[in-house]
C-alpha cells in the first residue's frame, strides 16, 4: 500500500484526540450549479401523495434549517381530487450527515451526526396481512 | 439569532478563516436508535412510481457509497399493474452533505461538500401547457 505522506501542507495532528477530531473546511463546495431543487419543484403539491414541508430549525446544528416532509393524507389523491384509502401515502426517508455543536454553543467545535429526514411522500400499495 | 458565548471550554478560534474551518469530532453519533429505518422499507417496489437504486461510489468521499433512485417508468403504475402515461413518475431530490479529504491524503483535514441525490420517486399530475 502507499504510505500517506504527512506532508507539510497538511494541518498538524498533535491534538491528543487525533484522529477523532479533525479540521473541516466549511466553505462548502456545491456540486449542484442549479437553483436549490427543493424550491424549484412543486411536486409536493402535484403528487398523488402530497406533503407539507415543515421547518426544523436548530441553531446548534449545521445546517441549522432542515425541511421535513409530512404526508397530507393517509391515503392517496385520485384524479377526481378525492382520497383513496385503499392506497397509502408514506414518507421517503434519507439518512443525512449534519454537524452538531459540541460542546454546545462553541462556535467552531462540532460533532458529526447522522439523522433521518423525510424528504417527500410516495403512494404505495398497502401490505395486507391475511388472517387464517 | 442567539449570541453564541465564546466560553473558555471551546477550542481557540484565532484562525483567520474562522468560522470557515472548524474542529469536528468524527466519532459519528447516530440519532436513529431503532432498527436502521433508512434501510428497512420496500417502498421502492410498492410505490405507484417505483424506482431502482443505483450505486454511486466514490472512494475519496464519505459516505463512499450513495444510492441514487431512478424512476422505473415515465408514467405511474395503476392498480391493474399497467402504466398510466397521463401521470408522471418523478424523482424527489435532496441536497446532502458529504465529507471529502482536502488536501487529498491529509489524514485530518476534510472539506464539506453538498451534493444532490434522488432519494425516491413520487407520482405527479403533469403540467399541461395549453396552446392558444
Amino acid at each position: 500500500g502507499i504510505a500517506i505522506p504527512r506532508n507539510s501542507g497538511c494541518p498538524n495532528s498533535e491534538d491528543k484526540n487525533f484522529p477523532r477530531t479533525v479540521m473541516v473546511n466549511l466553505n462548502i463546495h456545491n456540486r449542484n450549479t442549479s437553483t436549490n431543487p427543493k424550491r424549484s419543484s412543486d411536486y409536493y403539491n402535484r403528487s398523488t401523495s402530497p406533503w407539507n414541508l415543515h421547518r426544523n430549525e436548530d441553531p446548534e446544528r449545521y445546517p441549522s434549517v432542515i425541511w421535513e416532509a409530512k404526508c397530507r393524507h393517509l391515503g392517496c389523491v385520485k384524479a377526481d381530487g378525492n382520497v383513496d384509502y385503499h392506497m397509502n401515502s408514506v414518507p421517503i426517508q434519507q439518512e443525512i450527515l449534519v454537524l452538531r455543536r459540541e460542546p454546545r454553543h462553541c462556535p467552531n467545535s462540532f460533532r458529526l451526526e447522522k439523522i433521518l429526514v423525510s424528504v417527500g411522500c410516495t403512494c404505495v400499495t398497502p401490505i395486507v396481512h391475511h388472517v387464517a | 439569532g442567539i449570541a453564541i458565548p465564546r466560553n473558555s471550554g471551546c477550542p481557540n478560534s484565532e484562525d483567520k478563516n474562522f468560522p470557515r474551518t472548524v474542529m469536528v469530532n468524527l466519532n459519528i453519533h447516530n440519532r436513529n436508535t431503532s432498527t436502521n429505518p433508512k434501510r428497512s422499507s420496500d417502498y421502492y417496489n410498492r410505490s405507484t412510481s417505483p424506482w431502482n437504486l443505483h450505486r454511486n461510489e466514490d472512494p475519496e468521499r464519505y459516505p463512499s457509497v450513495i444510492w441514487e433512485a431512478k424512476c422505473r417508468h415515465l408514467g405511474c403504475v395503476k392498480a391493474d399493474g399497467n402504466v398510466d402515461y397521463h401521470m408522471n413518475s418523478v424523482p424527489i431530490q435532496q441536497e446532502i452533505l458529504v465529507l471529502r479529504r482536502e488536501p487529498r491524503h491529509c489524514p485530518n483535514s476534510f472539506r464539506l461538500e453538498k451534493i444532490l441525490v434522488s432519494v425516491g420517486c413520487t407520482c405527479v399530475t403533469p403540467i399541461v401547457h395549453h396552446v392558444a
Epitope: G1, I2, I4, P19, R20, V22, L112 | L26, N27, I28, T35, N36, R39, S40, S41, D42, Y44, N45, L53, R55, E57, D58, P59, E60, R61, Y62, P63, S64, V65, W67, L99, R101, H105, P107
Partner: antibody, heavy 117, light 106 residues
Framework: QVQLVQSGAEVKKPGSSVKVSCKAS????????ISWVRQAPGQGLEWMGS????????NYAQKFQGRVTITADESTSTAYMELSSLRSEDTAVYYC??????????WGQGTLVTVSS | DIQMTQSPSSLSASVGDRVTITCRAS??????LNWYQQKPGKAPKLLIY???SLQSGVPSRFSGSGSGTDFTLTISSLQPEDFAVYYC????????FGQGTKVEIK
Amino acid sequence: QVQLVQSGAEVKKPGSSVKVSCKASGGTFSSYAISWVRQAPGQGLEWMGSIIPWFGYTNYAQKFQGRVTITADESTSTAYMELSSLRSEDTAVYYCARDSEYYFDHWGQGTLVTVSS
Amino acid sequence: DIQMTQSPSSLSASVGDRVTITCRASQGISNWLNWYQQKPGKAPKLLIYAASSLQSGVPSRFSGSGSGTDFTLTISSLQPEDFAVYYCQQYSDDPTFGQGTKVEIK
C-alpha cells in the same frame, strides 16, 4: 485493484490475546470501513465489528463488545483486530473485508487463530 | 439481531442445471441483501449486492431477486466452478449471515 493482505496463522493459549493485521495494498483505505468477520471450522460467517480508518470510528457486534478492539494506522494502510480473553471457541479463521456499509466487496485471505492449551 | 435463514442447507446438482437458493430474513430488510460464494480454504466472494445487482466481474448466470423478507439466488446454468458454499447476508442492521447452502456435484 484493492488487495487486503493479512498476517500469518497464530496459536494462542486460553486467556491470552491475539492481534491480527490487515494491510491494504494497491491503494489507501479511502473512505470505506474495514470489517472483521470470523469463521469457526466447518461453520458459517460471523461479523465482529468495523472501523472507518478515515475517522477512527468503530462499531462492534454486541457479542464481542468489551473483548474485541479494532484499530487502524493510516500511515501504513493497516487495520488491526485484537481479541482478548481467548477461549477454545475462538478457534477460527479471521477475515478482514472492505466494507462500504452496504456490502463486503474485497476480502483478505484469512488468518487461522488456534486457541489451545 | 436480524436472523437469516437459508434453504436448502445443501443440494446436489449437475452441470447445466438451474439452481435456486432462498434466504428469509426475520424482519423486513428492504433490498439490503447480499450473496457471497465461498470455496474451500478461500475467502468469500461478493456475487450480488442490494438483492439484485450483479457485482462487476461476476458471470451473468448469477442473478438475485426479492425484497422485504424473501430473497432468491439463481444460477441459470450451473458450471463446474460454481460448486461451493453460498451465503446470504443482510446489511439493514449490523451485518448477519445465513448459515450457508452447499452446492455439491450430483
